[in-house]
């Protein structure tokens, strides 16, 4: 089981619609053909899995139908988008990359991206 470097931005601000995107880049030591990408959320020292996808190199990144994540891959970069975020979802989002095939197995864990989510102010009632 070998270690691998994973880079991701330190901070991202979600849009007013609760969408946050960031790039997760890994330093692949070889030509991996099966890669697993997982997004984890760390808040108050608790870690939970947000979403995960396994993809074959050259194919689309496919998350489960009910996932709040979407993504695309290009070489050793994965572009991740998380939707439906609210202020309470603010936290550290960690990108984990596993090179499943061919052997040897590699695991890389990023330092995390702090995603800030600000709920939009409700529109004031209008007399017009």
């Amino acid at each position: 089981c070998k270690a691998m470097h994973v880079a991701q931005p330190a901070v991202v601000l979600a849009s007013s619609r609760g969408i946050a995107s960031f790039v997760c880049e890994y330093a692949s030591p070889g030509k991996a053909t099966e890669v697993r990408v997982t997004v984890l959320r760390q808040a108050d020292s608790q870690v939970t899995e947000v979403c995960a996808a396994t993809y074959m190199m050259g194919n689309e990144l496919t998350f489960l139908d009910d996932s709040i994540c979407t993504g695309t891959s290009s070489g050793n970069q994965v572009n991740l988008t998380i939707q439906g975020l609210r202020a309470m979802d603010t936290g550290l989002y960690i990108c984990k990359v596993e090179l499943m095939y061919p052997p040897p197995y590699y695991l890389g864990i990023g330092n995390g991206t702090q995603i800030y989510v600000i709920d939009p102010e409700p529109c004031p009632d209008s007399d017009f």
Partner: nanobody, 119 residues
Framework: EVQLVESGGGLVQPGGSLRLSCAAS????????MGWYRQAPGNQRDLVAS???????YYADSVKGRFTISRDGAKSTVILQMNSLKPEDTAVYYC?????????????WGQGTQVTVSS
Amino acid sequence: EVQLVESGGGLVQPGGSLRLSCAASGNIFTRNVMGWYRQAPGNQRDLVASITPGGNIYYADSVKGRFTISRDGAKSTVILQMNSLKPEDTAVYYCNARGSILLDRVNYWGQGTQVTVSS
């Protein structure tokens, strides 16, 4: 607690066959690379065959065309079918699961099963 339990080893004549089975407990089966390793006396533990969650399969050159690895998701079992066995296949065979759970890497091993190929 995760357990990997191997079975199916034994004594077989050259040219014979054996079927090794590894039963995995816990929720490791679908998320991890499952493999078979072997270790002969005085040697290091070497990867024989592995299968990924996506179905990609690896074989060491020394067993290609003779060994077949497969997984039964319903039974959480990994099978190593060994045909045309040779005396140099004699070793202790270990089932392995490697991957990660949240932020922790995992590398589970079974207790091993002895395979002896001799006339």
